[in-house]
Every structure is written in structure tokens, then in C-alpha cells.
Interface confidence: medium
């Protein structure tokens, strides 16, 4: 904790300027008025404060705004943002995309994924939904940050905005997030022709159900293996060997490379070995000939 001392008269601060870098921590604490600091936050970034001096300045702002900083201060935090914890950021109400841009720029190159995720969350809450301008800002200044949002927040994305999302923005999205985004993408791209539709929907397919994957297998899409590997396990398991062959087209040979990895491994275990042999890839692990497959889940559901 910073010691409380009285400010020597010759050290009194009337302006936030470079002379402050020579103040010891206790002098900064005693001599810098928190309200003056808040009013002149835009100057802080132009002064080479040490890491420890920044701690003191943060402490002063925390005391002045225990319920969370106002946006007028947040917008000008600059590198002081690197001192904020997710708990600090959770108290904020941010609506301006200029504020978001400024802080995303500052966080670049620093290990701040938790803080950035919380900041984006506050922006979505502040603006009421994940609108096109917000998505555009995220894709421009923080590729991949879209996936830091919870499925609940992503559910506020209108389908009309989905077109602004690029494949690389979805690279870090998990299954639950893609579950939310996929139906929106399907709606957004529904009027497109087969090949154009597949190009657009491909990054979202990690959220597709079995029936949609089956439908794609009838459209000669030649799905690449990387996309196939990102499909939900539950969506892949019910597919027949013929459907997977149609779905992958010339890429079907890649199954051999991924033989030991989910969902390919799990899918192989569900297929008859005879059927797998028709692919001519030497895939092993299917159900041997003459075995009867009982689907116990059906019996359990009936009992």
C-alpha cells in the first residue's frame, strides 16, 4: 500500500506534466489530486512514468471512482489500461467505439486476453447488441476477439452483421460459440447459390447439425479436411461412408492422415469395416463383418 504523507508545498501539482516522473511514489500519492488527474488523463500517456508510478495513478483513480471509471476517463487511459484487471473493467460502462479502438491498440502485443475479453463484453452490454459497427471495429483492430465473447453475448448478433465476419475472426471460436453463430450465418447466406454459399458458411460449420452436413454432402462441395475436422463430433458420427466420401470428394484421402484424431477416429469406430474398405484408404477399426449393432440409446429412451 502507498504511504499517506502530506505534500511539501514546493511539490504541489497544478498540472499533469513530465516533471512528475521525478516524484517518488509517496509524493505522487500525496501531491497529485485525483480529480486533476481524471481531468487531464489525456496527458498521462505522453509522460514516461515507470510501472510503479502508474500503480499510484491507478490507485488514485480507483479511490475517486470506486464504482468504476466514467467513459471520459476510460477513453484516455492509454497505457494505464495495461494496469487494469478484468475485475476493474467489469465495473465500466463503455458505449463509444473510439474508446474501444484506443484501448485495443494499447493492448496489442501484451498478454491481456482476459482484459480485452471483458472490455469487449462491456461494450456489447453498453451498446445493447453486437451491431455491425462493433463487429467491424473488432475485425479491424482485434482479429479473433469476437471469439472472446460468451455465447450469450454472441446471441445478440443480428444475422445481417454476419457477412462482416471473416474466417480468421472465427479461428479461436469454440463449439458453443459456433452453435450460436451457425444458425445466424445460415440465415444470412440462405439466398446464395451452392458454391458461393459453401464458401461463406464454411467458417461457421463447427456449429452445423448432422442434417445440414448431410445436405452439403449432396452438393459436390469438396469440403477440405481442416473444415471436416472442425465439425461437431455429434454431427459427424451419423454420416455414412458414402456421405463422407461425397462430402469430401477428392479430399477423402486425408482421412488416413487423421485416422487417429477425433472426429475421424470416432466416426471410423461406428462404420462397418466392409464399408470403410470401399474407400481403399486402409482405414482400420470399423465394426467387423457379421457383428450386430444394437443402438441402446433408443431402447433407453423407450423404457
Amino acid at each position: 500500500d502507498v504511504e499517506r504523507t502530506t505534500c511539501p508545498p514546493e511539490k504541489e501539482v497544478h498540472e499533469i506534466d513530465e516533471s512528475l516522473i521525478f516524484y517518488k511514489k509517496r509524493e505522487l500519492e500525496a501531491c497529485v489530486d485525483a480529480a486533476l488527474l481524471a481531468a487531464q488523463m489525456d496527458r498521462v500517456d505522453a509522460i514516461p512514468f515507470t510501472y510503479e508510478q502508474l500503480d499510484v495513478l491507478k490507485h488514485k483513480l480507483d479511490e475517486l471512482y470506486p464504482q468504476g471509471y466514467p467513459e471520459s476517463v476510460i477513453r484516455h487511459l492509454g497505457h494505464l489500461f495495461l494496469k487494469m484487471s478484468p475485475e476493474d473493467i467489469r465495473k465500466w460502462n463503455v458505449t463509444s467505439l473510439e474508446t474501444l479502438k484506443a484501448l485495443l491498440k494499447v493492448s496489442k502485443g501484451h498478454e491481456m486476453s482476459a482484459q480485452v475479453a471483458t472490455l469487449i463484453d462491456r461494450v456489447v452490454v453498453g451498446r445493447g447488441q453486437l451491431d455491425k459497427d462493433t463487429v467491424d471495429t473488432l475485425t479491424a483492430f482485434c482479429p479473433g476477439c469476437l471469439c472472446s465473447l460468451s455465447p450469450e453475448r454472441l446471441s445478440s448478433v443480428p444475422p445481417s452483421v454476419i457477412g462482416a465476419v471473416r474466417p480468421q475472426d472465427l479461428d479461436t471460436c469454440g463449439p458453443r460459440q459456433l452453435d450460436v453463430l451457425y444458425p445466424k450465418a445460415r440465415l444470412a447466406f440462405q439466398n446464395m447459390s451452392g458454391s458461393e454459399y459453401f464458401v461463406k458458411i464454411r467458417p461457421f460449420l463447427g456449429g452445423a447439425p448432422t442434417e445440414d452436413v448431410k445436405a452439403l454432402s449432396q452438393q459436390n462441395v469438396s469440403m477440405d479436411l481442416a473444415t471436416f475436422m472442425k465439425l461437431r463430433r455429434e454431427a459427424v458420427l451419423p454420416l455414412t461412408v458414402a456421405e463422407v466420401q461425397k462430402l469430401l470428394g477428392p479430399h477423402v484421402e486425408g482421412l488416413k492422415v487423421e485416422e487417429q484424431h477425433s472426429p475421424v477416429r470416432d466416426w471410423i469406430l461406428k462404420q462397418r469395416q466392409d464399408d470403410l474398405d470401399t474407400l481403399g484408404l486402409g482405414l482400420q477399426g470399423g465394426i467387423p463383418n457379421g457383428y450386430l449393432i444394437l443402438d441402446l440409446s433408443v431402447r433407453e429412451a423407450l423404457s
Epitope: D45, L54, H79
Partner: antibody, heavy 120, light 107 residues
């Protein structure tokens, strides 16, 4: 890869001035503060001052105020240090060193050094 | 100004040794201390920051410890390429100050 390329050795007469340059490459010049450090024979390293390229604002060690002037040219990603009223005491190796002021606060990359010799 | 004292100007060592270089600050600097290595004709290289964090690419035989006023740089298994000058530096407050350096030499 990061590089701080300093200008070559200087031999100057007492009373003259000299301007040393430090060209940054391989990183965003405005994201790091630029420090200058003096290494003289028989003495340790001495911090001269720091400049924030983004704003052009600088701060100096009291000992070097009036002796050193720090400037930057953002367009060429180059930092400069001018030393004036030179005496033999200023003969030393001068380094520029970048400092991500807000992330560890240490001088994580240094230029190769510029040797200054002040002699009549 | 904060004075950083490296009491040993020279230290004799042999390959494989465990070497500890000490540095004392004239007042509390928390963990705002860095260690640098400088070989003849080269510029200083950052080894340790925030008293104990190893900088990217620095071999794990180098470790830093300490807080407040007393700091140690330890080389656990001395190698011939480690023969150099070692400087500590505080960045708790301005002006930034350095220790006078400790030179490692072969016995």
C-alpha cells in the same frame, strides 16, 4: 528482427556539438520509449534521458540537462541525441535502448553503441 | 538518486561453477530491477527483468531473486560464454540508475 542501428564513431573538438542517430526497425517505433545511456571508461552506465516517440516528449537525468537534447523523426523511425559544449568528460560510448515503459520497464534491446571522442 | 551497489568489481570463476552476483539498492525499489550482460565490444543484453523474470531466449541457468533492497543474479552452471560484465539497474524511480558492474573472469 528488432534492430537499433546507431550512427558511426565521432571525433570532435572541444566546444563543438554532435548529433547521434538511432534508427529503429523490426517493430513499431511509436510503441516503445527510447532511452539514451552513457558508458564511460572506468565508470558505470549512466542514464541520460528518455523520449516518447509518439508525442516527442522527453525527460532528462538532471545531470545531463542542458548537455543532451533528445528528438525523434517518426517518419524515418529514428531517434536523435544532440550533445553540445563538448569536453573530454563527454568522451564515451553512447547507447540508445528501447523501453516498453509499461511492460516490465527494462531496456530490452540496445543499439550497438556510438563511440564519441572529444579531443583537440 | 537511488544508488545501486555491486560490491564485487571482479569475480573469479571456473566452468561449471555456481556464481552469485549481488546488488544492493540504497532504498526500497520493490522488484523494479533488471540485470544486463555485456561482453567486450558488444552492447548490453537484458537477462532478467522485474527482479526474477527471465527475458525471452535467456538460458535457464540464469536466475534472478530478491526484492526491496537486496538482489542476486545466479548463474547455476557457469559456461565460458558467460564471461562478461554484469550490471543491475533499478527502474522504481527516476533517474534510472545502474550498478557499477561485476566482471566475471576465469580463475
Amino acid at each position: 528482427e528488432f534492430q537499433l542501428q546507431q550512427s558511426g564513431p565521432e571525433l570532435v573538438k572541444p566546444g563543438a556539438s554532435v548529433k547521434i542517430s538511432c534508427k529503429a526497425s523490426g517493430y513499431s517505433f511509436t510503441d516503445y520509449n527510447m532511452n539514451w545511456v552513457k558508458l564511460s571508461n572506468g565508470k558505470s552506465l549512466e542514464w541520460i534521458g528518455v523520449i516518447i516517440p509518439n508525442y516527442g516528449t522527453s525527460s532528462y537525468n538532471q545531470k545531463f540537462k542542458g548537455k543532451a537534447t533528445l528528438t525523434v523523426d517518426q517518419s524515418s523511425s529514428t531517434a536523435y541525441m544532440q550533445l553540445n559544449s563538448l569536453t573530454s568528460e563527454d568522451s564515451a560510448v553512447y547507447y540508445c535502448a528501447r523501453w516498453d515503459n509499461y511492460y516490465g520497464s527494462s531496456l530490452d534491446y540496445w543499439g550497438q553503441g556510438t563511440t564519441l571522442t572529444v579531443s583537440s | 538518486d537511488i544508488v545501486m551497489t555491486q560490491s564485487q568489481k571482479f569475480m573469479s570463476t571456473t566452468v561449471g561453477d555456481r556464481v552469485s552476483i549481488t546488488c544492493k539498492a540504497s532504498q526500497n525499489v520493490g522488484t523494479a530491477v533488471a540485470w544486463y550482460q555485456q561482453k567486450p565490444g558488444q552492447s548490453p543484453k537484458l537477462l532478467i527483468y522485474s527482479a526474477s523474470n527471465r527475458y525471452t531466449g535467456v538460458p535457464d541457468r540464469f536466475t534472478g531473486s530478491g526484492s526491496g533492497t537486496d538482489f542476486i543474479l545466479t548463474i547455476s552452471n557457469m559456461q565460458s560464454e558467460d564471461l562478461a560484465d554484469y550490471f543491475c539497474q533499478q527502474y522504481s524511480s527516476y533517474p534510472l540508475t545502474f550498478g557499477a558492474g561485476t566482471k566475471l573472469e576465469l580463475k
